[in-house]
């Protein structure tokens, strides 16, 4: 996986008018990093995670940047001639990854509504725009205000792309980004579901990164996709995530299943509980 | 510690019973089921069925049928193999395994040796 | 009922050596497949199961791999303590059925 810094900036208008707000959150590798709120903007580590790792760093350069994207972005809004009564939001995503062969891949998407309508790629400046009539409108107008100033956007689009990329090396030789694993946690639970059956619930959370397979077995082999119940894999909070698979068993048949688990290049296996015992915590094997 | 502890040897005449047992120590004793598995002399393992645990219900592998029976003292975590109508070829080292999900051996005992000879 | 064939059933090796166990099903068994260690009059000992996955304190020198019906048990660095003899279990069907065991003997 590629080391990767994620801005998303949020601006808000209402009934035409662009509000003096707004939020930015960053993200490094796919965790929650930086928070910028509309209240007051000052860059902070999110959750307990960032804050060991980040110690008592001052973030004041962030917060200047921040700051100014948000205040291009809200001018940006207000050149947006389709401001309709009502609540209106304009969205920038800038993504920058370096991948272990040292390449990079810069990208900034543009959303209005939540509905995406205009993409760059930072590096070969080339403009991509989904077909929709409405879509090509908002990106002509977006494109038109940003091209009113030739200067400002050829040296803005590739200080961000430089900007971000500089950013996220600064982040790596730091030693914010740790290419850290965390093994999971798992558990099996069951729960009483309909007469003669029960749910049997696997649950795996801790861990990182987030790429994790879960599943249970009966018998040994793996149960068919359509027998299983799957969670999304989300952040706990902590710069971890969680996890869960379930399935429905006939009661007595317990001993039959088990739950496999596989991160990072780790197995085990996690059998379910029978009777009145109801969580069976397993380590790994 | 996880532990599978069996009878000891056994002695029988042709026609005899023999019952072995195998305690648990270690683990939840209804949460898995148990296995046992034959080892004739010099021979390999012969997998003859297993016992869920927490039903009491038994699954015996073709050749295992009639003669052999599983069963279980759960207040004791022991399980039991009993066969009957002993016959030359029943002499053997049996095994019990703790069943994981059904498809792994785990944890054994140490076997028990039963010789059928008049 | 799977038939499960090992090969060699009996393997000369010295100390040091990286020994190789093969077994091979009769049909397909998709990874479903576990390896025992057994020494003199001792229980059988668990290695490795689904294929290559070493259960708890089973040593690195030891591997396994395969697919379909052919399955393989490596020593990369034989020791004393691994003289012993090595079933194959396949869990791919009933009834469990296992490998007829390779001896590994000191040469």
């Known amino acids: 996986e590629p080391h990767s810094l994620r801005y998303n900036l949020t601006v808000l208008s209402w009934d035409g008018s662009v509000q003096s707000g707004f939020l930015t959150e960053v993200h490094l590798d796919g965790q929650p990093f930086l928070r910028c709120d509309r209240q007051k903007c000052r860059a902070k580590p999110q959750g307990q995670w960032a804050e060991d790792v980040l110690g008592n760093k001052t973030w004041d350069r962030e917060t200047r940047d921040l700051t100014g994207n948000g205040k291009d972005l809200r001018m940006t809004l207000a050149h947006i001639k389709d401001q309709k009564e009502g609540l209106h939001s304009l969205q920038e995503i800038r993504v920058c990854e370096i991948h272990e062969d040292n390449s990079t891949r810069s990208s900034q998407h543009f959303y209005y509504d939540g509905e995406l309508f205009l993409s760059q790629n930072l590096e070969t400046k080339e403009w991509t725009m989904p077909q929709s009539s409405r879509a090509q409108t908002l990106a002509m107008n977006v494109r038109n205000f940003l091209k009113e100033d030739a200067m400002k956007t050829k040296t803005h689009y590739h200080a961000m792309h430089a900007d971000c990329l500089q950013e996220l090396r600064r982040y790596l030789k730091s030693g914010v980004v740790l290419r850290r694993t965390v093994p999971p946690m798992v558990n099996v639970t069951r729960s009483e579901a309909s007469e003669g059956n029960i749910t049997v619930t696997c649950r795996a959370s801790g861990f990182y990164p987030w790429n994790i397979t879960l599943s249970w077995r009966q018998d040994g082999v793996s149960l068919s996709h359509d027998t299983q119940q799957w969670g999304d894999v989300l952040p706990d909070g902590n710069g971890t995530y969680q996890t869960w698979v379930a399935t429905r068993i006939c009661q007595g048949e317990e001993q039959r299943f088990t739950c496999y688990m596989e991160h990072s290049g780790n197995h085990s296996t996690h059998p379910v509980p029978s009777g009145k015992v109801l969580v069976l915590q397993s380590h790994w094997q | 510690q996880i532990q599978l502890v069996q009878s000891g040897s056994e002695l029988k005449k042709p026609g005899a019973s023999v019952k072995v047992s195998c305690k648990a120590f270690?683990?939840?004793?209804?949460?898995?089921?148990m296995n046992w598995v034959k080892q004739a002399p010099g021979q390999g393992l012969k997998w003859m069925g297993w016992?869920?645990?927490?039903?009491?219900?038994?699954t015996y592998a073709q050749g295992f049928t009639g003669r052999f029976v599983f069963s279980l003292e759960t207040s004791v975590s022991t399980a039991y193999l009993q066969i009957s109508s002993l016959k030359a070829e029943d002499t053997a080292v049996y095994f019990c395994?703790?069943?994981?999900?059904?498809?792994?051996?785990?944890?054994w005992g140490q076997g028990t040796l039963v010789t059928v000879s008049s | 009922d799977i038939q499960m064939t090992q090969s060699p059933s009996t393997l000369s090796a010295s100390v040091g050596d990286r020994v190789t166990i093969t077994c091979s099903a009769s049909?397909?068994?998709?990874?479903?497949l576990n390896w025992y260690q057994q020494k003199p009059g001792k229980a059988p000992k668990l290695l490795i199961q689904?294929?290559?996955l070493l259960h708890s304190g089973v040593p690195s020198r030891f591997s396994g791999s395969g697919s379909g019906t052919e399955y393989t048990l490596t020593i990369s660095s034989l020791q004393p303590d691994d003289f012993a003899t090595y079933f194959c279990?396949?869990?791919?069907?009933?009834?469990?059925?296992f490998g007829g065991g390779t001896k590994v003997e000191i040469k």
């Open positions: 395994a703790r069943n994981y999900g059904n498809y792994l051996f785990d944890y």
């Open positions: 270690g683990y939840t004793f209804t949460n898995y089921g």
């Open positions: 016992i869920n645990t927490y039903t009491g219900e038994p």
């Open positions: 049909q397909g068994i998709s990874n479903y």
């Open positions: 689904y294929t290559s």
């Open positions: 279990q396949q869990y791919s069907k009933f009834p469990r059925t």
